[in-house]
Structures are given as structure tokens and as C-alpha cells.
Interface confidence: medium
């Protein structure tokens, strides 16, 4: 007898993994056998669409290979022209593992700045984002959030926020994990310790002290009076993101030094800076105190110049006089560099035996200045361009530092050797006489400015260089 | 923080040669003389050899004159002593030290802790 | 040849004052031979105490003092202490045709 088509089995939600097999069942009992149809989301499923299979006379429906479009609701529909057609429906549910579609990555920021590291993701159940930081969960707080999107957020990010970060998308079906990624904190350069200004005595060492945080590790620049420092030592240490910067300074004037702490972010910089002032207690004092002491010259750069057994005078207004006399010799010969083979050894020579003066033992230890014969004979013959070209640069202010102001003596100002023989020094180093004069080059005037005497002549003419400190 | 630190020291026979080093940080090398200082075993103190801040000069003990030769590398910051013609009297822990300034005489303000040489058969 | 002189040792009660000295085997020490002192303790390198006659090392206490007494150099110690117990070392530039730099022979102190 005939049999109008009833279903069975009605259609079930049914839940399937992408990539999986999906099999909708439709079973029907009716004579003669029925058309069954499918249809998702109330279009026709086509016989020949070889994305499903359809058996068993149209009762089973298989989706071989489920994808995330795959998802909607899907009917079978009976008819065997006996009584009306009948339907059963039920969903599909494509679930997914989580997945991260936009993953995070390495951000550097500069620290009291807003950070956001991505992490969008895909699944179904909707995956749940939580973030790791180095090895442990990352707790929210009133700065981090992890926001809706999965995305992390960092308010007024610092310095301890550095570090690897991962996010973990996590549903019923799994866990996927971002790589690690890198948050770099870069921090202005900040200055921890100042530099502190000094009184100091002329031609004493003082150090000056700059101590400086950053990331990165700031570089340390010193400034002094306006131009990058020409002399001193400079000293630096880093340890743990904190460079330690120390000038040792010779001090011979009076001057600005600032600290400059400077260091990247991006293209552009960031600097910290901090002055201190070095000021010298009565600044004439060289010039005029004679408090020292008689000493063995043991020193290096005039070797060559003072006699080898000779007591020099050692001014005790230097915090270290063998120390800062020997600097100024040494100083001095750099601030004369181009001199001619004719002048250096008169030059050394008047410059060592005019800072280590010969020394007159006694209850008060006394200095004894050059005789100005000779002052005069290296002023006037040996250097006389070299002198002329010196006087000129210290009228115009080009020499860096006051320090050649003690190295040359004013001729004038000195002992004749005519009013008392023992009153001053002879320079054993000019070793010429009257007759030698014809051999050097042409004065700048026509004769000498005072009668230079028969200096004590010795076998050689020539004049003994130290070959360690010459003056090119 | 100064540090100096030898190297170089071991068992040599008679005649034989051996290279001091002497590392040296926490200073700014090039500014400072340096010296080269022995102890024999159970003995005092006996300076070897000096030399200033740019190298120019050297010094010697008498007896060392002729076989030791001090020298700097300031771009290294290294002090060296080469030993040659050792005797058994060359015997010591060799001291490197700092002396207070830049001349080859200061005091010796910082020393390492010193490489023992012994020369034997 | 002039060889540095020195105390072979010594001994001084904890709170005691100390003068060791620093002399010539002929001649007198004089500020030109820049007296430094040194202290070394056992199995360890020396320690600068004083340079140049009377200038202290940075960190070495108030109670070393270094002078010229007549024709030696001397070094002071006021309120010794246990820790002061060492070997005490003299050392002296010298200009004899060529500079040379000559330690003394050691004093062995004992804090008793």
C-alpha cells in the first residue's frame, strides 16, 4: 500500500572539526521510495557538488572535508508524490582549535609611553587570550589589561615591564601559543650623580665625578668651558645600565666642565646634563710663592736638559710639585710644537731650568732663576721667529691654557748675571760662544738687546736633545 | 678599582728566557709609571726595573742589566719584563706595581699579587 | 755599594707607639731620596702606606705617619693594634751616577 514519507530520524545538531568529516542522517520510511533533497541555509545542495557525498538514496549527507563556511543549518526534505513532502533540519557547527591570526611582535618604547602588543585569534568555541611574561602568567592590573581583541595593553609602560612576552589563545578544543616576543623599555638619559665644583689650589688633580642611567646605556661627554675637553684622563665604567664617567683634570685655570649624558631612541636622542665649576684659591700663587723644597730631579722629560746630580726646587703650592712641575715641561713643549732643530734644545733647556729651578739648599730652600743673559740668548737667538709667533698667540688668547704663561719666563724680569754671579743660574745646554753667532739665521733685529756673554764652550757645538720629548 | 694582574711566572731552567705580562685596568694605563718589584722566598723586597708613562726611558737593578728588558704597550695596556740568561738567583715572585704618576720614580701606590719564576735544573 | 738599612723586627704593645726607621749605610736620607714605606703581611703584595717622606696613601689610616728624624727616614705608628702586626718596608730613590730605586731589608713587626 502506498505510504506517504515519514522521517525517522529527524536531523541533529551536528559538531565537526575543520578538516574533518560532518554526516547528516535522514532516514525515511515510505512507499515507493521517496526523492530526498538537502539544502544549507535554504539552498539546494547539487547532486554533483563533490564536496559532499550523498548514499544511501539520499539519506546520508557527508561533507568530506569541513571548513569554516561550512557552518549553517541544513535539511532534508521527503517526497514520494503520496501526502506532502516532509522536512528535518538540523545545524552544523564547525569547531575550531584556536588559532592567532595577528601575532604579536618585538616593540620597543620609550618608558611613560602606551604599549599595545597584538594577538588576534580565531576558534570556535571563541578561544579565551591570557598572556605570559618570561615564565609566568601576566596579571592585569591597573596599567595592563588584556583587551577584547586579545591585544595587550600597557599604560604609562616601565622599566620592569621589559621583557618576553607570549599570548596563549585557549579553547575546549586546545591551546595555540604566539612566538616569544621582546619588549624593549628604552629610558631618557637621566643623571644620577653631578659632577661637584672645587676650589682647588693651582696645579692640583681633581676628579670630577658623572654618573649616568639610561637605556640604552647613555655615552658620556665632557664639555669644558663650551668645547669638548682637550686634556685630562677620562676614566668609565657600566654596570648595570649605570655608566660611571671620571676627568682627571691638571688644573692650571678656572673653568665650566659639563657632563653630557646622551643616548637613542629611534632616530632622535636624549640628553641629561650637569655642570660643576673649578675655581683656583688664589690664582696668582704660582707666580709668587716660593714655599718648597730642595729634591733630586727624578722626573723624565728633562733627562737630558738638567744636570745629573743637580737639587731642584719643588714649589709646594702644587698639590704634587714633582708631579705638576714635570706636566708643565711636558705641557709646555706641546704647546711649541713647530720649532727648528736650532731652538729646541735651547728651548728644553730654558724650559726645564725654569720650572725645576735649580735649588739653593738652606734653612729656607730657595730657587734660583736663570740668568737673563740667557733667557735673553734663547729669546733673541735661538728662537726668535718661535718667540715672536708665541707672544703673538698669547696676545690673541689662542693658547688653550695659562700653563705657557709659567713655562716661559719674562727675560726682563730676571737676574743679571752682571750684578751677582751666584744670584742666578747659567743653562749649560747653550753651549756657544761669540764666534758660534755668525752660524744661526737672521735676528729679527739688528742686535741682541743686551751684550750676551762668552758662555763656557765645550768640545761639541751641539746641543744635547732628549730623543724621548722633543718638541715636533 | 686599580687592578694589575702578572702573568708569564713558572719553571725555567738556567739560561733560559721567559715573558712577564702585566695586565693593568681601573686606571687610564698610559698616564702612570711602572715598575717591575721581586721577593725571593722568605726574603725582602728588591726593585727590578722602572719605566715612565711614555716608555722613553728605562731602569734597571745592576744585576738585571743586560739579560731584563721592561717595556709598555699603552694601546693594550700591558707592562711586560723580558727575562733572559736566567740564574737560580732570579728566583722570585715578581710584583708588578703603579707608581703615583706619570715619572718612572714615584712611589709604587697599587701592585698585583705577583707570578712566581723559578728557574732551576 | 750603599744598602738601605732597617730594624730586622720590632714589637709594640696594642695602644703602643712605634718608630721604625730608614737609614744609609753611609750617608744621611734626605727629602731627595723620597723615603716611601710600604706593609706587606703574610703570603699577600705590599700596600703603600707613605710616599715621599710624609704624604699618606689614600685609605691608610691617621695613625702611620712618615718624617725625616736626623739622618734617617721614620715611620710612626701611634695606637697600634693587632692588625698592624706585619713586615714594614722602606723604600728610597737613589742618584748614583744612575737612578735607582732601593727597598731596605724589612722590619718584622710584632704586636704582643
Known amino acids: 500500500l502506498p505510504k506517504a514519507p515519514v522521517i525517522t530520524t529527524p536531523l541533529e545538531t551536528v559538531d565537526a572539526l575543520v578538516e574533518e568529516v560532518a554526516t547528516f542522517m535522514c532516514a525515511v520510511e515510505s512507499y515507493p521510495q521517496p526523492e530526498i533533497s538537502w539544502t544549507r541555509n535554504k539552498i539546494l545542495i547539487k547532486l554533483f557538488d563533490t564536496r559532499y557525498s550523498i548514499r544511501e538514496n539520499g539519506q546520508l549527507l557527508t561533507i568530506l572535508s569541513v571548513e569554516d563556511s561550512d557552518d549553517g543549518i541544513y535539511c532534508c526534505t521527503a517526497n514520494n508524490g503520496v501526502g506532502g513532502a516532509v522536512e528535518s533540519c538540523g545545524a552544523l557547527q564547525v569547531k575550531m582549535k584556536p588559532k592567532i591570526t595577528r601575532p604579536p611582535i618585538n616593540v620597543k618604547i620609550i618608558e611613560g609611553l602606551k604599549a599595545v602588543l597584538p594577538c588576534t585569534t580565531m576558534g570556535n568555541p571563541k578561544p579565551s587570550v591570557s598572556w605570559i611574561k618570561g615564565d609566568s602568567p601576566l596579571r592585569e592590573n591597573s596599567r595592563i589589561a588584556v583587551l577584547e581583541s586579545g591585544s595587550l595593553r600597557i599604560h604609562n609602560v616601565q622599566k620592569e615591564d621589559a621583557g618576553q612576552y607570549r599570548c596563549v589563545a585557549k579553547n575546549s578544543l586546545g591551546t595555540a601559543y604566539s612566538k616569544v616576543v621582546k619588549l624593549e623599555v628604552e629610558v631618557f638619559a637621566r643623571i644620577l650623580r653631578a659632577p661637584e665644583s672645587h676650589n682647588v689650589t693651582f696645579g692640583s688633580f681633581v676628579t670630577l665625578h658623572c654618573t649616568a642611567t639610561g637605556i640604552p646605556v647613555p655615552t658620556i661627554t665632557w664639555i669644558e668651558n663650551g668645547n669638548a675637553v682637550s686634556s685630562g684622563s677620562i676614566q668609565e665604567s657600566v654596570k648595570d645600565r649605570v655608566i660611571d664617567s671620571r676627568l682627571q683634570l691638571f688644573i692650571t685655570k678656572p673653568g665650566l666642565y659639563t657632563c653630557i649624558a646622551t643616548n637613542k631612541h629611534g632616530e632622535k636622542f636624549s640628553t641629561a646634563k650637569a655642570a660643576a665649576t673649578i675655581s683656583i684659591a688664589e690664582w696668582s700663587k704660582p707666580q709668587k710663592d716660593n714655599k718648597g723644597y730642595c729634591a733630586q730631579y727624578r722626573g723624565e722629560v728633562c733627562n737630558a736638559v738638567l744636570a745629573k746630580d743637580a737639587l731642584v726646587f719643588l714649589n709646594t703650592s702644587y698639590a704634587d710639585p714633582e708631579e705638576a712641575q714635570e706636566l708643565l715641561v711636558h705641557t709646555a713643549w706641546n704647546e711649541l710644537k713647530v720649532v727648528s732643530p736650532v731652538c729646541r734644545p735651547a728651548a728644553e733647556a730654558l724650559l726645564c731650568n725654569h720650572i725645576f729651578q735649580e735649588c739653593s739648599p738652606g734653612v729656607v730652600p730657595t730657587p734660583i732663576p736663570i740668568c737673563r743673559e740667557y733667557c735673553l740668548a734663547v729669546k733673541e737667538l735661538f728662537c726668535a721667529k718661535e718667540w715672536l709667533v708665541m707672544e703673538e698667540k698669547t696676545h690673541r688668547g689662542l693658547y688653550r691654557s695659562e700653563m705657557h704663561l709659567l713655562s716661559v719666563p719674562e727675560c726682563s724680569k730676571l737676574p743679571s748675571m752682571h750684578w751677582d754671579p751666584t744670584a742666578c743660574a747659567r743653562l749649560p745646554h747653550l753651549d756657544y760662544n761669540k764666534e758660534n753667532l755668525k752660524t744661526f739665521p737672521p735676528m729679527t733685529s739688528s742686535k741682541p738687546s743686551v751684550d750676551i756673554p762668552n758662555l763656557p764652550s765645550s768640545s761639541s757645538s751641539s746641543f744635547s736633545v732628549s730623543p724621548t720629548y722633543s718638541m715636533t | 678599582e686599580v687592578q694589575l694582574l702578572e702573568s708569564g711566572g713558572g719553571l725555567v731552567q738556567p739560561g733560559g728566557s721567559l715573558r712577564l705580562s702585566c695586565a693593568a685596568s681601573?686606571?687610564?694605563?698610559?698616564?702612570?709609571?711602572m715598575s717591575w718589584v721581586r721577593q725571593a722566598p722568605g726574603k725582602g723586597l728588591e726593585w727590578v726595573s722602572a719605566?715612565?708613562?711614555?716608555?722613553?726611558?728605562?731602569y734597571y737593578k745592576e744585576s738585571v742589566k743586560g739579560r731584563f728588558t721592561i717595556s709598555r704597550d699603552n694601546s693594550k695596556n700591558t707592562l711586560y719584563l723580558q727575562m733572559n740568561s736566567l740564574r737560580a738567583e732570579d728566583t722570585a715572585v715578581y710584583y708588578c706595581a703603579k707608581r703615583s704618576g706619570r715619572i718612572a720614580f714615584g712611589a709604587l701606590d697599587a701592585w698585583g699579587q705577583g707570578t712566581l719564576v723559578t728557574v732551576s735544573s | 755599594q750603599t744598602v738601605v738599612t732597617q730594624e730586622p723586627s720590632f714589637s709594640v704593645s696594642p695602644g703602643g707607639t712605634v718608630t721604625l726607621t730608614c737609614g744609609l749605610s753611609?750617608?744621611?736620607?734626605?727629602?731627595?731620596?723620597?723615603p716611601d714605606w710600604y706593609q706587606q703581611t703574610p703570603g699577600q703584595a705590599p700596600r703603600t702606606l707613605i710616599y715621599?717622606?710624609?704624604s699618606r696613601h689614600s685609605g691608610v689610616p691617621d695613625r702611620f705617619s712618615g718624617s725625616i728624624l736626623g739622618n734617617k727616614a721614620a715611620l710612626t705608628i701611634t695606637g697600634a693594634q693587632a692588625d698592624d702586626e706585619s713586615d714594614y718596608y722602606c723604600?728610597?730613590?737613589?742618584?748614583?751616577?744612575?737612578?735607582?730605586?732601593?727597598f731596605g731589608g724589612g722590619t718584622k713587626l710584632t704586636v704582643l
Open positions: 753611609s750617608g744621611s736620607v734626605t727629602s731627595s731620596n723620597y
Open positions: 723604600g728610597l730613590y737613589m742618584y748614583s751616577g744612575s737612578k735607582n730605586y732601593v
Open positions: 715621599s717622606t710624609d
Open positions: 681601573g686606571f687610564t694605563f698610559s698616564d702612570y709609571g
Open positions: 719605566i715612565p708613562w711614555q716608555g722613553g726611558s728605562t
